[in-house]
Amino acid sequence: IPPHVQKSVNNDMIVTDNNGAVKFPQLCKFCDVRFSTCDNQKSCMSNCSITSICEKPQEVCVAVWRKNDENITLETVCHDPKLPYHDFILEDAASPKCIMKEKKKPGETFFMCSCSSDECNDNIIFSEEYNTSNPD
């Protein structure tokens, strides 16, 4: 950090490595929860027009696809992978692509993905060819 920039105590808004290099924040689609027409497709675009700067540099992009008897929704956000989201760990946070994995949620079909390249949650991928691990 440059000498004229104060380093505050307990600052999670800036992440540095051992050499003092600074991590830039992620750019993610961030529309929270929106109704979606994405269904039975290998991949979908988020149709979210808002690309936001994540508040903290350690945050990654997340997408959550949910289907129940009434509707389908797609949620796009930034989130810290050290913290669970919807009670699930973001195990794929280092991935450059948002590869959807099914999670067990009663009463609905629930898929979630996370990734760490710019706007990577704009293109959500359900295709089996990308999934190398079993869903939870």
Epitope: I1, P2, T16, D17, A21, V22, K23, F24, I53, D118
Partner: nanobody, 124 residues
Framework: EVQLLESGGGLVQPGGSLRLSCAAS???????RMWWVRQAPGKGLEWVS?????????YYAKSVTGRFTISRDNSKNTLYLQMNSLRAEDTAVYYC?????????????????WGQGTLVTVSS
């Protein structure tokens, strides 16, 4: 020598406007994503806005969306931040910085060179 020189800060009343400038030299301006970053007194850095080198795609933190507008003039090697509807919580030192698009980390602890910053104080 790489230089980033911010200007345009000052004292403004809540609801007022300011336009910050950042004059860049010593590097190929059109190769870099440019950022405005701010630091409020006693607080950490907040990433305010960014703009792509070509095509002028822009990005904003949620806290400033709809109030701030980032722009750049590649012919003048200058970055701008138009700040409207200013609030007390916008009081901070504002820095510009440069990033090679796609690179996650700066090359060194000087954020690929910072400017010295310009102080914005929003107070009645």
């Amino acid at each position: 020598e790489v230089q980033l020189l911010e200007s345009g800060g000052g004292l403004v009343q809540p609801g007022g406007s300011l336009r910050l400038s950042c004059a860049a030299s010593g590097f190929t301006f059109t190769e870099y994503r440019m950022w405005w970053v701010r630091q409020a007194p006693g607080k950490g850095l907040e990433w305010v806005s960014a703009i792509e080198p070509i095509g002028n795609r822009t990005y904003y933190a949620k806290s400033v969306t709809g109030r701030f507008t980032i722009s750049r003039d590649n012919s003048k090697n200058t970055l701008y931040l138009q700040m409207n509807s200013l609030r007390a919580e916008d009081t901070a030192v504002y820095y510009c910085a440069k990033q090679i698009p796609g690179r996650k980390w700066t090359a060194n602890s000087r954020f690929d060179y910072w400017g010295q910053g310009t102080l914005v104080t929003v107070s009645s």
